[in-house]
């Protein structure tokens, strides 16, 4: 039975040209995290494996930085970066947990962080 929950940074906004940290946290399970995949819609951004380190997809390599931790930093944001981002936790023996973050990139300087929320 999958007992874990993923806590994410929820709905967030950031300024065009700025950067943002996408973070998820898996809790309430003793399952071992084998790797975390970061995806945007149907595109792979990055993979983090505790032992093998990071893979950054080449189409994002100039604008994505690994970390902090299992999180991902998006840099030089554009309005085209607005959309859904997913952290996919591959765990043993539970299986896969997915968290969702919605990022809105704003033209103005008014960019506030949304509240945290949980996905079971």
């Amino acid at each position: 039975m999958m007992t874990g929950t993923i806590e994410t940074t929820g709905n967030i906004s950031a300024e065009k040209g700025g950067s943002i940290i996408l973070q998820c946290h898996l809790s309430s399970t003793t399952a071992q995290v084998t790797q975390v995949n970061w995806e945007q819609q149907d595109q792979l951004l990055a993979i983090c494996n505790a032992d093998l380190g990071w893979h950054i997809s080449p189409s994002f390599k100039d604008r994505v930085a690994p970390g902090p931790g299992l999180g991902l930093t998006l840099q030089s944001l554009t309005v085209n970066d607005t959309g859904e981002y997913f952290c996919i936790y591959h765990t043993y023996p539970d299986g896969t947990y997915t968290g969702r973050i919605f990022l809105e990139v704003l033209e103005s300087s008014v960019a506030e962080h949304g509240a945290r929320f949980q996905i079971p």
Epitope: L44, N49, L52, H55
Partner: antibody, heavy 119, light 107 residues
């Protein structure tokens, strides 16, 4: 120039163990994970697992857990793979291969080590 | 485990021909796919990574395309030295897996 120099061919008896080495040069050994790949005669490639030379952390293909042990010697920039309880099914060519930086692709491979298990 | 299926074990072609090798993943692997070339008696060599990126020094007659479950490796004008085995490889999730290989034979 990046080089991965593997140890020579091995002929061993069933039930024995063998340790294959992969001596590297031309790059910062601890900054890139090292992997091992099996190629049975006339067959495809199988990923055995990888090791982070900096931390010693390993990730294995479940199929090879308990069969293969990956280690490194940082002082000599050498990676090792020990194979135990050998059977004829383990007869194959084994390659070490390093990953690209921040990408899960093998950019350099050793020349391969042929392992023959026979009584 | 993700199974990578290369439907053709052998492909026969002539120098100058265009040839395409296909690879199908048993589940969506996004673009986490590479293509390797292995010439007789040699170690594999990286040609294409992330489905469509040509590795440094690889001639531009080699191209890759696809995403999700269907991937294609193409040689636009086959040369005699392209006689080799070609493997697809996924790293979307461990254990990383390879296709069964396609042997390119020159007529």
């Amino acid at each position: 120039e990046v080089q991965l120099q593997q140890s020579g061919p091995e002929l061993v008896k069933p039930g024995a163990s063998v340790k294959i080495s992969c001596k590297t040069s031309g790059y910062a050994f601890t900054e890139y994970t090292m992997h091992w790949v099996k190629q049975s005669h006339g067959k495809s490639l199988e990923w055995i697992g990888g090791i982070n030379p900096n931390t010693g952390g390993t990730t294995y293909n479940q199929k090879f857990k308990g069969k293969a042990t990956l280690t490194v010697d940082k002082s000599s920039s050498t990676a090792y793979m020990e194979f135990r309880s050998l059977t004829s099914e383990d007869s194959a060519v084994y390659y070490c291969a390093k990953l690209l930086r921040l990408m899960y692709y093998f950019d350099y491979w050793g020349q391969g080590t042929t392992l023959t298990v026979s009584s | 485990d993700i199974v990578m299926t290369q439907s053709h074990k052998f492909m026969s072609t002539s120098v100058g021909d265009r040839v395409s090798i296909t690879c199908k993943a048993s589940q969506d692997v996004r673009t986490a796919v590479a293509w390797y070339q292995q010439k007789p008696g040699q170690s594999p060599k990286l040609l294409i990574y992330s489905a469509s990126y040509r590795y440094t020094g690889v001639p531009d007659r080699f191209t890759g395309s696809g995403s999700g479950t269907d991937f294609t490796f193409t040689i636009s004008s086959v040369q005699a030295e392209d006689l080799a085995l070609y493997y697809c490889h996924q790293h979307y999730i461990t254990p990383w897996t390879f296709g069964g290989g396609t042997k390119l034979e020159i007529k």
